[in-house]
């Protein structure tokens, strides 16, 4: 059993051009985390398994927002190591596979977004014990520096952590009369004591006193970088004019990489950077399989038909991306019919309809001669695929639910005064005038114009109470006919009220889930 | 091979409760949603809830028919989910599967849980 | 929470013949329709995704086809190890539902 340890350095813009300043999108600030995953690479049997070494998911970063003209640094990283036990013994052989997510912190309904910023996948061999090993690896346009070492947890000891051992201290377990001990048990050592001042960072011993440098490292503590020429790398016949060496046959010629991956030439060799889903020496081994969950959010992992992929991810509504680590805006497509305002929650779009709307894309017009929709005694009228209300006197708007004032129109003849009342309108004639609209003439012998009508009533004539009680009456039976419309109309818009309010409630249930 | 195993189910009372098992090898547990699904007796099947990764905080999801009577936890070290059902009723008795992902594209064999006095 | 409805219930054929399994849903789902499979004292496993993409290993005599509210899953020619209970479920809106079931039996 032991402990494989990894420890990123830094994560950041590549050298050269075209390098992105920010790992962030526009979308505001992000943080970075890493997905470390091992797998024995001793065969293809084992390369095509999950991580069956481990794998381990690093802590958030801080949080890190791109200042504007600032140079790209080398990013903000998560604290501590990156830790993978293993139960088993250590295989030597490994494949190293080291994931860069971004989370982005944006404004965003139903959680942050995470994306694959870059994916390194190496086979190595390390010996359990030994010192930090140092990589540069490119992916894409960034570069990633790390460390990694397996060790051992006592009592295992060894190069595989295979042999067990006690404390030199610890009095011997064999006592008179039994049997040898084990002969797996060792003696434990403790680690050597480096020579004073050697690097922690760049030097490690295996003797008591000795300061062993790693590679790019020299000097007495390893503290000197290693110089580089520029002529590094070619080959062919000397040049006489440059010092340096004329180019021969490069090592990519006829592309040595496989599935798809393209070659860079290195120093007296070359390098495959593989597509996704593979890696080895010549991206020969399948990396990734739909074992490891290589799909974020829930995406079904599918084999890939074609060689150039080791497998596909179906993304669940949402979400999109090679990985399904991008979330999509579903809401920019406007779904919600009417002016219904929409919210992504994630796994569900949902639209709060605006008044007099309703279904989940808020398609249904409520307010249509089949809903009743004419208010305050209006009459619905249809035609053409639309409808319109006529109101009822004193009413007017779309749905009769705007006060009119009846007076605006000047109905009341000959002086009359107009006086605006729930039913309509009342008009107190001038003298010398009657009815509805003070439209008849009275005769000044107390006979109207008309032969049929009553006689006037002239100011103080003590049957205009009478007239007047009726009048009130009348007006009474109006209003208790309106009431009577308004809480038919109030019954039936509650029954769309509480389906609205619950739509609500599931919403806020869904978005605080 | 990719294998879920459930295990837990049994006989309990009405108001009674039971813990569920769920152990996976052949995948990278940590990297997958998990979810529980039950089929009572003779019926279709029916979500019961779901867990999501350490880096989403292990947020988890419930049908309303459960909601604060059951629990679902995961520990990544030991690739097992777990079902924690409290106040159990009689609709409760079902077979009941854990899968993974948003498409329960992996299926256990399923674990009997009886609620009946 | 969206509700599928399946038909028929019971589907009696032929090894050989050709089934038709139909789902319904109460609103649109896009294609976020899978099928299942089930057969007796097993537990359910998955055919086809997305509406019409056969999952890993699925013979291809398993189709299926539709988008919005009506879908179909469809048996080229019935093995005597497709008689089973079939589901229809949709992954559109959270929770994911299942259909009532279909089940295809020998005639």
């Known amino acids: 059993a032991g402990v494989f340890e990894l420890q990123i350095h830094s994560f950041g813009p590549g050298p050269g051009p075209g390098a992105p300043r920010s790992p962030c999108s526009a979308r505001g600030p992000c943080r970075l985390f890493f997905r470390v995953c091992l797998k024995p690479g001793l065969s293809e049997e084992a390369a095509e398994s999950p991580c069956a070494l481990g794998a381990a998911l690093s802590a958030r970063g801080p949080v890190y927002t791109e200042q504007p003209e600032a140079p790209a640094p080398d990013l903000p990283l998560p604290n501590g190591l990156l830790q993978v036990p293993f139960r088993d013994a250590w295989p030597g052989t490994f494949s190293l596979i080291i994931e860069t997510w971004r989370e982005e912190l944006g404004d965003q309904i139903g959680g942050p977004a995470w994306s694959l910023l870059a994916r390194v996948t190496r086979r190595r061999r390390l010996a359990a014990g030994g010192p930090w090993a140092r990589d540069i690896q490119r992916a894409g346009a960034w570069e990633l520096r790390f460390s990694y070492r397996a060790r051992c947890e006592l009592p295992a000891v060894g190069t595989a952590c295979t042999r067990l051992c006690r404390p030199r201290s610890a009095p011997s377990r064999c006592g008179p009369g039994l049997r040898p001990c084990a002969p797996l048990e060792d003696e434990c050592e403790a680690p050597p004591v480096c020579r004073a001042g050697c690097s922690l960072e760049h030097g490690f011993c295996e003797q008591p006193g000795e300061c062993r440098c790693l590679e790019g490292w020299t000097g007495p503590l390893c503290m000197v970088p290693v110089s580089t020429s520029s002529c590094l790398g070619l080959r062919g016949p000397s040049s006489t004019t440059t010092g340096c060496l004329v180019p021969g046959p490069g090592p990519c010629d006829g592309n040595p990489c496989a599935n798809g991956g393209s070659c860079s030439e290195t120093p007296g060799s070359f390098e495959c950077t593989c597509p996704r889903g593979f890696y080895g020496l010549r991206c020969e081994v399948s990396g990734v399989t739909c074992a490891d969950g290589p799909c974020f959010n829930g995406g079904l992992c599918v084999g890939g038909a074609d060689p150039d992929s080791a497998y596909i991810c179906h993304c669940p509504p949402g979400f999109q991306g090679s990985n399904c680590e991008k979330r999509v805006d579903r809401c920019s497509l406007q779904p919600c019919r009417n002016g219904g305002l929409c919210l992504d929650l994630g796994h569900a779009l949902r639209c709060r309809c605006r008044a007099g709307f309703a279904g989940p894309r808020c398609e249904h017009d409520l307010d249509d001669c089949a809903g009743r929709a004419c208010a305050n005694g209006g009459t619905c009228v249809e035609g053409g695929g639309a409808h319109r209300c006529s109101c009822a006197l004193g009413f007017g708007g779309r749905n009769c639910r705007e006060r009119a004032d009846p007076c605006a129109a000047r109905p009341c003849a000959h002086g009359g005064r107009c006086y605006a009342h729930f039913s309509g309108l009342v008009c107190a004639c001038a003298p010398g005038y009657m009815g509805a609209r003070c439209e008849f003439p009275v005769h000044p012998d107390g006979v109207s114009a008309l032969p049929a009508a009553p006689p006037g009533l002239r100011p103080g004539d003590p049957q205009r109470a009478g007239v007047i009680a009726v009048i009130v009456v009348v007006v009474i039976a109006i209003v208790a006919g309106i009431v009577v419309l308004v809480i038919s109309r109030k019954k039936r818009m509650a029954k769309y009220e509480k389906a609205e309010i619950k739509e609500m409630g599931e919403m806020h249930r869904e978005l605080n889930a | 091979e990719v294998q879920l195993v459930e295990s837990g189910g049994g006989l309990v009372k009405p108001g009674g409760s039971l813990r569920l098992s769920c152990a996976a090898s052949?995948?990278?547990?940590?990297?997958?949603?998990m979810n529980w699904v039950r089929q009572a007796p003779g019926k279709g099947l029916e979500w019961v809830g779901q867990i999501r990764l350490k880096s989403e905080d292990y947020a988890t999801h419930y049908a309303e028919s459960v909601k604060g009577r059951f629990t679902i936890s995961r520990e990544d070290s030991k690739n097992t989910v777990y079902l924690q059902m409290n106040s159990l009723k009689t609709e409760d008795t079902a077979v009941y599967y854990c899968t993974t992902g948003y498409y329960f594209d992996y299926w256990g064999q399923g674990t009997t849980v009886t609620v009946s006095s | 929470n969206i509700v599928l409805t399946q038909s028929p219930a019971t589907l009696s054929l032929s090894p050989g013949e050709r089934a038709t399994l139909s789902c319904k849903a109460s609103?649109?789902?896009?294609?976020?329709v899978s099928w299942f499979q089930q057969k007796p004292g097993q537990s359910p496993r998955l055919l086809i995704y997305?509406?019409?993409n056969r999952y890993t290993g699925i013979p291809a005599r398993f189709s299926g086809s539709g988008s919005g509210t009506d879908f179909t899953l469809t048996i080229s020619s019935l093995e005597p190890e497709d008689f089973a209970v079939y589901y229809c479920g949709q992954f559109y809106s959270f929770p994911s539902t299942f259909g009532g079931g279909t089940k295809v039996e020998i005639k």
């Open positions: 997305g509406a019409s």
């Open positions: 609103e649109n789902v896009g294609t976020y």
């Open positions: 052949g995948i990278t547990f940590s990297n997958f949603w």
